[in-house]
């Protein structure tokens, strides 16, 4: 009685169950009543990451330096190459097929989270008591200078873009 379903890591062909090829190998020929499935290793720069019956291996991803990409992890016969972006850039998608320059936080905004190879800079508005007077991908909002601790008084109030200006206290005559 020919099988209608096969075990895990097998497939049904010509009324018989054949073993799938292991990760890193491709199918050359189905099994027969005399021999097992014929599988061969993927070539250099190729991979298959699952038990399979593929007749061709997949090409490793190319990390194109013209797109700002570099290799984060070299591919094997069982895994694809993982790309990431050059310093100062981040991936435009989860697949990391191209890179864009990290965003800078404008004056009045500070860096909440520094960008990584896969995520952009996260900016936040400087709250009261803090300021940022530069456009930067690294600078956080800085606290206003405390005039009091320097025995000075505020001569000009700070904003989210400027620090306070301190000056000497008026002397009592």
């Amino acid at each position: 009685e020919p099988p209608t379903a096969c075990r895990e890591k097998q497939y049904l062909i010509n009324s018989q169950c054949c073993s799938l090829c292991q990760p890193g190998q491709k199918l050359v020929s189905d099994c027969t009543e005399f021999t097992e499935t014929e599988c061969l290793p993927c070539g250099e720069s190729e991979f298959l990451d699952t038990w399979n019956r593929e007749t061709h291996c997949h090409q490793h991803k190319y990390c194109d330096p013209n797109l700002g990409l570099r290799v984060q992890q070299k591919g094997t016969s069982e895994t694809d190459t993982i790309c990431t972006c050059e310093e100062g850039w981040h991936c435009t998608s989860e697949a990391c097929e191209s890179c864009v320059l990290h965003r800078s936080c404008s004056p009045g905004f500070g860096v909440k989270q520094i960008a990584t190879g896969v995520s952009d800079t996260i900016c936040e508005p400087c709250p009261v008591g803090f300021f940022s007077n530069v456009s930067s991908a690294f600078e956080k909002c800085h606290p206003w200078t405390s005039c009091e601790t320097k025995d000075l008084v505020v001569q000009q109030a700070g904003t989210n873009k400027t620090d306070v200006v301190c000056g000497p206290q008026d002397r009592l005559r």
């Epitope: 062909i13 020929s29 027969t32 014929e38």
Partner: antibody
Framework: QVQLVQSGAQVKKPGSSVKVSCKAS????????ISWVRQAPGQGLEWMGM????????SYAQKFQGRVTMTRDTSTSTVYMELSSLRPEDTAVYYC????????WGQGTLVTVSS | QSALTQPPSASGSPGQSVTISCTGT?????????VSWYQQHPGNAPKLIIY???KRPIGIPDRFSASKSGNTASLTVSGLQADDEADYYC??????????FGGGTKLTVLG
């Protein structure tokens, strides 16, 4: 059970081409590669190349690169091996076989190259 | 791709054992566990008797056994019979969708 039946013997002149066919029956044609092997009189086996019928992709031994072409016709479950610029030393029995493992063989086709 | 190296001939008496070697390189026999052995009687197509270094197709008697060490594969025929007299060829996958054969060994059964 896969069976491979090859075309008949041929006599060719030097400089000409020969095309040998290999018709497969039994099994699923697109699910196994076909290798071509030749054997000159009194000599050993020589692997010429292979074709993957599912996509038609080929791989040829370096020695035959540029002179051999392997094709397939899925409608008739037939693969072909064409060898061009024949010379007398190409006189041999040409076999098709299933896969790289070559677990099933055709009966062989004698190609004689003679002026 | 150079041919794998086999002794041109081997012999033994009925009932004895004979071993045939097949020496390649670290790019073929040594690199992959995809060595096959074939038996060819005169006037016939070759017949697969061993694949994947040591596996026998169903129907091939266990008198035929094989192994591999480093860059050399070996076929042993034990309990020699008159019908074992034939040519024996090894082959190995050599990477990049290439295959290479040995030069062949003529096995003679004496007596």
């Amino acid at each position: 059970q896969v069976q491979l039946v090859q075309s008949g013997a041929q006599v060719k002149k030097p400089g000409s081409s020969v095309k040998v066919s290999c018709k497969a029956s039994g099994g699923t044609f697109s699910s196994y590669a076909i290798s071509w092997v030749r054997q000159a009189p009194g000599q050993g086996l020589e692997w010429m190349g292979m074709i993957n019928p599912s996509g038609g992709t080929t791989s040829y031994a370096q020695k035959f690169q540029g002179r051999v072409t392997m094709t397939r016709d899925t409608s008739t479950s037939t693969v072909y091996m064409e060898l061009s610029s024949l010379r007398p030393e190409d006189t041999a029995v040409y076999y098709c076989a299933r896969g790289f493992r070559m677990d099933q063989w055709g009966q062989g086709t004698l190609v004689t190259v003679s002026s | 791709q150079s041919a794998l190296t086999q002794p041109p001939s081997a012999s033994g008496s009925p009932g004895q054992s004979v071993t045939i070697s097949c020496t390649g390189t670290s790019s073929d026999v040594g690199a992959y566990n995809f060595v096959s052995w074939y038996q060819q009687h005169p006037g016939n197509a070759p017949k697969l008797i061993i694949y994947d270094v040591r596996k026998r197709p169903i129907g091939i008697p266990d008198r035929f056994s094989a192994s591999k060490s480093g860059n050399t594969a070996s076929l042993t025929v034990s309990g020699l019979q008159a019908d074992d007299e034939a040519d024996y060829y090894c082959s190995s996958y050599a990477g990049n969708n290439n295959l290479v054969f040995g030069g062949g060994t003529k096995l003679t059964v004496l007596g």
